[in-house]
Interface confidence: low
Amino acid sequence: TEGCDPSRVRVHGPGIQSGTTNKPNKFTVETRGAGTGGLGLAVEGPSEAKMSCMDNKDGSCSVEYIPYEAGTYSLNVTYGGHQVPGSPFKVPVHDVTDASKVKCSGPGLSPGMVRANLPQSFQVDTSKAGVAPLQVKVQGPKGLVEPVDVVDNADGTQTVNYVPSREGPYSISVLYGDEEVPRSPFKVKVLPTHDASKVKASGPGLNTTGVPASLPVEFTIDAKDAGEGLLAVQITDPEGKPKKTHIQDNHDGTYTVAYVPDVTGRYTILIKYGGDEIPFSPYRVRAVPTGDASKCTVTVSIGGHGLGAGIGPTIQIGEETVITVDTKAAGKGKVTCTVCTPDGSEVDVDVVENEDGTFDIFYTAPQPGKYVICVRFGGEHVPNSPFQVTALAGDQPSVQPPLRSQQLAPQYTYAQGGQQTWAPERPLVGVNGLDVTSLRPFDLVIPFTIKKGEITGEVRMPSGKVAQPTITDNKDGTVTVRYAPSEAGLHEMDIRYDNMHIPGSPLQFYVDYVNCGHVTAYGPGLTHGVVNKPATFTVNTKDAGEGGLSLAIEGPSKAEISCTDNQDGTCSVSYLPVLPGDYSILVKYNEQHVPGSPFTA
């Protein structure tokens, strides 16, 4: 139209940038200097939009429109029938958003529950806050932004997942439509992955007033508040030998540990979580006798042939031997048995309890030589135990005359004026000139569920050599790691699942010398120590007969030695090194070095 210039029309205001549903969205059209023409306004979009225009009588109009649904709207502004600059305007229209109506909750925001290196999550409920983009920012202790994953649950809620990489203060900002939601930024103190100080052990199996020897006992480990770590329980008997331990994962943050204290005396129970000892570990528990072992009688049959009331002095290798123990008159208690081979290791023994008050002991001698059989009831030796038998190869004639009237053959023969002691011949000499056969295999039961993937292990020995332990999935939420050491000293074990360390790995452990029928010394003080802190070890003389124990420590400083007789055939030795360096610990029995002596710590 003559005198009309649409290019001089100016449109401005928030309503052409963005809009909100169910609310008036305003913009202004200025036609000053554009001549005379008709102003045309039209809105197209997902819904109808109510539109109104007010002439300001100053060459401008104020326009309002109310859209009813979210989406992109097209605003057409014409002057004199022609589009003005910028028209049609594409306007994103959102629902009304109110960040104050957003609710955040869940363990990933809860104090005392968030632990490093473990997946954390929390929920964001935006169902009452309208539709807007959700932004989440996780900042670590040094302000470093860490990855975060937001999953839309399609029900008006979102799940936020993150894995804090370290312990310390974290700040989690949650923005909804560029606005902080209530309580944001959330301040979260991330705790260590595991905290052994929060692990609790309790139950009858830890009762220091005494547990009944030979009967199974159990205790509970509560790690509910301790994060995720590797639980390791090592129980050693009064001689320092590791005991078979059964750990059951109760899948509620607690574990039940069962063991059988088969010998009377003091047991040491070491509990570690994530490689750290829990409070009050190691526990020391006394096993007290039950029933009356002196009332038991023993008979034996070899290869199914009865030998009457006694244990014959010779057996055949590879042939199953059955020892029957009649405990009817002995009261409450159970039979336990160990069979020591000529080289000082132990043979697998099965003990079967019969309904008639008897127990059958089954074992097979794998090699020729002298065997020592310890049969106990209620933790105490039955009459004449320990017994000594000689295993012969099939073609080897028995050189021993049969014992008169099938007497039991005790390990010790008594002579007037003293005691004669039997000890097995010296076993093979192995690493470092030490007795390799006395390094016992041990089992570590770890609560860990293998879903899919491979669990692997590696042991680094003190010499630097590497060995592979045997790992078995017990299909009950635990795996058993079995390792037969060939060196004494500090070892390190890696356990990985799909090539990733499992919680608590790598773990360190000490290997000491224990043996059947010898004087032995074992304990941390023989391998390492800390200046001005008592270093301790134990000397076991239980199976050694009469003799004198002598101790000496040579090193950079004079080290005070104290020795306590535990009245159970063992001595607790403590020494105090006051200067750093290598100390030589000499342990002699009857002027003879015990296996491993002199030790270097």
Epitope: K200, S202, G203, N207, T208, F280, R284, S572
Partner: antibody, heavy 118, light 107 residues
Framework: EVKLVESGGGLVQPGGSLKLSCAAS????????MSWVRQTPEKRLEWVAY????????YYPDTVKGRFTISRDNAKNTLYLQMSSLKSEDTAMYYC???????????WGQGTLVTVSA | DIVMTQSHKFMSTSVGDRVSITCKAS??????VAWYQQKPGQSPKLLIY???HRYTGVPDRFTGSGSGTDFTFTISGVQAEDLAVYFC?????????FGAGTKLELK
């Protein structure tokens, strides 16, 4: 934060009875063995009673055996000490403490004062 | 009953000093000895258990040693806040018994 709060102390005549309570919070009460320990006016510490975490086992020293009974309600996170036939030598500050026997006493309450006097 | 004897009722020290408190058991208690600190108006606080193990959160200036019948509790570098009464206790057998306490005070 671990909290043990004793209550129920007060003045009682010789031969009388009193029941002390200890409300526990901040830890899994049912996992912990618990004890009562008292401190005499001369500041000597004396162990008075022990109860296992499930409540099945109790121990007492001879000085209170037969007169004092320790009990617990794990659902309420509360430990109790029922004291009867009280004597003047039972006058003390009574503390409830976690553990005892298996372990030393790790957590202690602030104490409640029991005075036995005519 | 096992009697725990703390030979010194009082011990004088200065800030920065090293001080050792001894405790003797009337019979062998192996390593089952704990040490507690008690400040005026407060309940006792566990410092050491099993003769030499520091309890969670206890500063490393506090150490324990000994086994059998003779036990020692040491503070290396006494601080003003360490002035308190220190008790030993055996947790070897029932009845559980405490020492009479040693009060640490400034010279």
């Amino acid at each position: 934060e671990v909290k043990l709060v004793e209550s129920g102390g007060g003045l009682v005549q010789p031969g009388g009875s009193l029941k002390l309570s200890c409300a526990a919070s901040g830890f899994t009460f049912s996992s912990y063995t618990m004890s009562w320990v008292r401190q005499t006016p001369e500041k000597r510490l004396e162990w008075v009673a022990y109860i296992s975490n499930g409540g099945g086992s109790t121990y007492y020293p001879d000085t209170v055996k037969g007169r004092f009974t320790i009990s617990r309600d794990n659902a309420k996170n509360t430990l109790y000490l029922q004291m009867s036939s009280l004597k003047s030598e039972d006058t003390a500050m009574y503390y409830c403490a976690s553990d005892g026997i298996i372990r030393p006493f790790a957590y202690w309450g602030q104490g409640t004062l029991v005075t036995v006097s005519a | 009953d096992i009697v725990m004897t703390q030979s010194h009722k009082f011990m004088s020290t200065s800030v920065g000093d090293r001080v050792s408190i001894t405790c003797k058991a009337s019979q062998d208690v192996s390593l089952d000895v704990a040490w507690y600190q008690q400040k005026p108006g407060q309940s006792p606080k566990l410092l050491i258990y099993s003769a030499s193990h520091r309890y969670t959160g206890v500063p490393d200036r506090f150490t324990g040693s000994g086994s059998g019948t003779d036990f020692t509790f040491t503070i290396s570098g006494v601080q003003a806040e360490d002035l308190a009464v220190y008790f030993c206790q055996q947790h070897y057998s029932t009845p559980l018994t405490f020492g009479a306490g040693t009060k640490l005070e400034l010279k």
